[in-house]
């Protein structure tokens, strides 16, 4: 079987940065310890600019 | 149109409390986490308190730590900010702000994209 | 908690100038820095997240670049709009602190 998605919900300790396994509209938010509602990461072409080049990370990682 | 509208801000005396309210619109508050920042007359900004309402986690900056609490009511889409023994300090606008978070290998990347207009609080005697 | 040092406190500038503003963090928050500017009276608006990337609806005049400790604003050209206060805020970990702010006047 593939790997399944994980939704964890649970509040995380102060020092934990390691992204917890979200599920597909979700990513993990630091600030707050918990996996929140994240919307697509925008490029140039639709609207956000940067120096830096936003890469594949469109969507959360597959769980392993 | 996305929008948070603040209430409930006004003159107190020192030890009294206060609620305000964070109605929002536009958004679901229930899968993002709400901010509660204020700011001092002629002052920077300072953050007070979060929650993500989906499961009620809620932190809270040591200056107001056991006497705000953030609570929020997903089925009215509005989050509140009790304050109690309210202190001269506590003087300042407070903002509601919503977090936005753009996924960023399974990680948020964001920051306070909409905001209140602010209510302010007077606390004096 | 992590402490955001702004610099300058304020600047005088003239429309069309280059201006850029700094703000180090007390300890490494990778990119995690958003930058807002604030008018009087008014809600501060998103200008930058995530270190440098423009956030949508922002004039392209403003650039942010940084990770680690060290980050700076830029505006490319300073416009009369551009008269305000600006703060940066680090997000990675609770509490989200700010900047003591950067106000730009007119020179």
């Known amino acids: 079987m593939g790997a399944r998605r994980l939704r964890v919900r649970s509040q995380r300790s102060r020092d934990s940065s390691v992204p917890t396994q979200c599920n597909q509209t979700e990513c993990f938010d630091p600030l707050v310890r918990n996996c929140v509602s994240c919307e697509l990461f925008h490029t140039p072409d639709t609207g956000h600019t940067s120096s830096l080049e936003p890469g594949t990370a469109l969507q959360p990682q597959e769980g392993s | 149109e996305v929008q948070l509208v603040e209430s409930g801000g006004g003159l107190v005396q020192p030890g009294g409390s206060l609620r305000l309210s964070c109605a929002a619109s536009?958004?679901?508050?229930?899968?993002?986490?709400i901010h509660w920042v204020r700011q001092a007359p002629g002052k920077g900004l300072e953050w007070v308190a979060w929650?993500?309402?989906?499961?009620?986690?809620?932190d809270y900056a040591d200056s107001v730590k056991g006497r705000f609490t953030i609570s929020a009511d997903t089925s009215k889409n509005t989050a509140y900010l009790q304050m109690n023994s309210l202190r001269a300090e506590d003087t300042a606008v407070y903002y509601c702000?919503?977090?936005?978070?753009?996924?960023?290998?399974?990680?948020?990347?964001?920051?306070?994209?909409?905001w209140g207009q602010g209510t302010l609080v007077t606390v004096s005697s | 908690d992590i402490q955001m040092t702004q610099s300058p406190s304020s600047l005088s500038a003239s429309v069309g100038d280059r201006v850029t503003i700094t703000c180090r963090a007390s300890?490494?928050?990778?990119?995690?820095v958003a930058w807002y500017q604030q008018k009087p009276g008014k809600a501060p608006k998103l200008l930058i997240y995530?270190?440098?990337f423009l956030y949508s609806g922002v004039p392209s005049r403003f650039s942010g670049s940084g990770s680690g400790t060290d980050f700076t604003l830029t505006i490319s050209s300073l416009q009369p709009e551009d008269f305000a206060t600006y703060y940066c805020?680090?997000?990675?970990?609770?509490?989200?602190?700010f900047g003591q702010g950067t106000k730009v006047e007119i020179k």
């Open positions: 702000a919503r977090r936005v978070c753009y996924n960023r290998l399974g990680v948020c990347a964001g920051g306070m994209d909409y």
């Open positions: 536009g958004f679901s508050i229930r899968s993002i986490s």
């Open positions: 805020q680090q997000s990675l970990i609770t509490p989200p602190t």
């Open positions: 995530s270190a440098s």
């Open positions: 929650i993500t309402p989906f499961n009620g986690t809620t």
């Open positions: 300890q490494d928050v990778s990119t995690a």
